[in-house]
């Protein structure tokens, strides 16, 4: 289902992207699901829609709810849902679990902490960083673009890291904070050339025309923290984002798992409303890390619906 959880704090800016993506030329309409009321596009409103983005400038607790976005093209409409929750600011230092973004792991060799969701905002450096509510000071900490680098990482560096930045909209400034946990792993691991668990090489996947289909690219990269590792899909040798078919989307973010102690990643390719022309495409699952790239190719074939007539 094309639904996404988003959260923010009252009196801060919150920008939410429609989970259904399309070409920039496509129009996107936003509605408040409970009332089916259209979200205005005029920027003078505190809450307004701007193409694929829904902006709360600033957010209020009462804004919580489910918002519907409809991507409209000349040939189709696609619907997505943004489940938005705005929380009151905490008086104490503790950041509750429901405000935390995904945990990242680091090691002596790799200690980047990315500021979550920052790419959605119009921000300018510097980015401020806090650990357990204390401003980070000292030469070991380097704020670089949208991430924090910690030199000579130690186990004591584990904790909750908050990034704070200013979003600018038409000359007005709004504060944004985002918090995620950072864990430190022992460098006891090793890295392998990527091993793709699924799909099998030259796999043929049966799909039904008009139905939705999912393809999962799953690969393992070694044990412990991996310096560089990614899985992704390509269509006819082209990145999904460049291919320009809104019906075919990669799941945002990569799911990390540990299989037999190995660090693995998977990426789901979602094809909505499968069409005949989708059967002609070559789907490449790419797994890559420091050592290199392994590619498994999948093709789709039509699954014949079972004939229930005798």
């Amino acid at each position: 289902k094309f639904s996404k959880q988003s959260w923010g704090l009252e009196n801060e800016a919150l920008i939410v992207r429609c989970p259904r993506q399309g070409k920039p030329s496509y129009t996107v309409d936003w509605y408040y699901s409970q009332t089916n009321k259209s979200i205005p596009t005029q920027e003078r409103n505190r809450v307004f829609a701007s193409g694929q983005l829904l902006k709360f400038l600033p957010a209020a607790v009462a804004d919580s709810g489910i918002y519907t976005c409809i991507v409209r093209s000349p040939t189709f409409n696609r619907t997505g849902y943004a489940n938005v929750t705005i929380y009151k600011k905490q008086s104490d230092c503790n950041v509750p679990d429901y405000l935390m973004y995904s945990t990242v792991s680091g090691s002596e060799k790799n200690s980047k902490i990315y500021c979550p969701t920052i790419d959605l905002y119009n921000w300018t450096a510097p980015l401020e960083w806090f650990k357990n509510c204390q401003a980070l000071q000292g030469s070991r900490y380097r704020a670089h673009k949208s991430f924090l680098v910690i030199d000579n990482v130690m186990t004591e560096d584990a904790g909750d890291y908050t990034c704070k930045f200013i979003h600018n909209e038409n000359g007005a400034n709004y504060s944004v904070t985002a918090t995620r946990s950072f864990t430190v792993k022992d460098e006891q691991g090793f890295s392998l050339f990527p091993v793709i668990g699924a799909p099998a090489q030259n796999e043929i996947k049966e799909v039904e025309i008009g139905k939705n289909a999912n393809l999962t690219c799953s690969a393992c990269f070694g044990k412990g923290t991996q310096f560089l590792a990614a899985v992704l899909w390509q269509l006819n040798g082209t990145k999904i984002t460049d291919f320009g078919e809104p019906r075919i989307q990669q799941e945002e973010g990569q799911n990390q798992s540990f299989s037999n102690g190995l660090a693995c990643l998977d990426m789901v390719l979602r094809i909505a409303d499968v069409k005949e022309e989708d059967l002609l495409l070559q789907y490449d699952c790419l797994a890559l890390n420091l050592h290199g790239l392994r590619r498994h190719t999948v093709r789709l074939s039509r699954k014949n619906p079972i004939d229930h007539h005798s």
Epitope: F190, L228, K239, L288, L290, G292, L293, R295
Partner: antibody
Framework: EVQLLESGAEVKKPGSSVKVSCKAS????????ISWVRQAPGQGLEWMGG????????NYAQKFQGRVTITADESTSTAYMELSSLRSEDTAVYYC?????????????????WGKGTTVTVSS | DIQMTQSPSSLSASVGDRVTITCRAS??????LAWYQQKPGKAPKLLIY???NLKTGVPSRFSGSGSGTDFTLTISSLQPEDFATYYC?????????FGGGTKVEIK
């Protein structure tokens, strides 16, 4: 078969910067890794850093951190290496190199394809 | 950084000789090792990858062995075109590092 074409020789003054380009043809540029390796006269090979366009990030040897910037332009299939605050010890041949394919695998950092090298001379 | 130490730094040999060059890593690099040949004024040429895999098109007189920290490049019967400098390189971790090189000269 991938081919790498490097820009021409450069003569630079100490303290200045140099930007060397490496244009790739053949294959899918975004999937390559491009490494930059230098060799001072009569010396061995030294890896400066590399970029994997599909990752969009560059990695550098500590020795060059802060002085070297490696970028890639996917639209022109060109990688660049810029070295700043040049000193006489930076006089060297600068090679770009990419990995190789073997049995559906693409090895990033086993360097199979090399440019001819760009000679950079730093002299006052 | 992982240090790669090659020995000897140079050697003299005759055509037909068996030549062995060793490379030692400062920590285990599994089999993430390559061997290159470089002739004066030319770019290096990849000979062996993954410590023991011969790249297609490289003569079978070249072979590689070892894993962990100790590696060997062997030329079973030296030919006139083999006189060159040989380098090992690890790709186990960033930064990539090369050995200092072994120059094989005519005796």
């Amino acid at each position: 078969e991938v081919q790498l074409l490097e820009s021409g020789a450069e003569v630079k003054k100490p303290g200045s910067s140099v930007k060397v380009s490496c244009k790739a043809s053949g294959g899918t540029f975004s999937s390559y890794a491009i490494s930059w390796v230098r060799q001072a006269p009569g010396q061995g090979l030294e890896w400066m850093g590399g970029i994997i366009p599909i990752f969009g990030t560059a990695n550098y040897a500590q020795k060059f951190q802060g002085r070297v910037t490696i970028t890639a332009d996917e639209s022109t299939s060109t990688a660049y290496m810029e070295l700043s605050s040049l000193r006489s010890e930076d006089t060297a041949v600068y090679y770009c190199a990419s990995g190789f394919y073997s049995n559906d695998l693409y090895y990033y950092y086993y360097m199979d394809v090399w440019g001819k090298g760009t000679t950079v001379t730093v002299s006052s | 950084d992982i240090q790669m130490t090659q020995s000897p730094s140079s050697l003299s040999a005759s055509v037909g000789d068996r030549v062995t060059i060793t490379c030692r890593a400062s920590q285990s690099i599994s089999s993430w090792l390559a061997w290159y040949q470089q002739k004066p004024g030319k770019a290096p040429k990849l000979l062996i990858y993954d410590a023991s895999n011969l790249k297609t098109g490289v003569p079978s007189r070249f072979s590689g062995s070892g894993s962990g920290t100790d590696f060997t490049l062997t030329i079973s019967s030296l030919q006139p075109e083999d006189f060159a400098t040989y380098y090992c390189q690890q790709t186990y971790a960033i930064p990539l590092t090369f050995g200092g090189g072994t120059k094989v000269e005519i005796k």
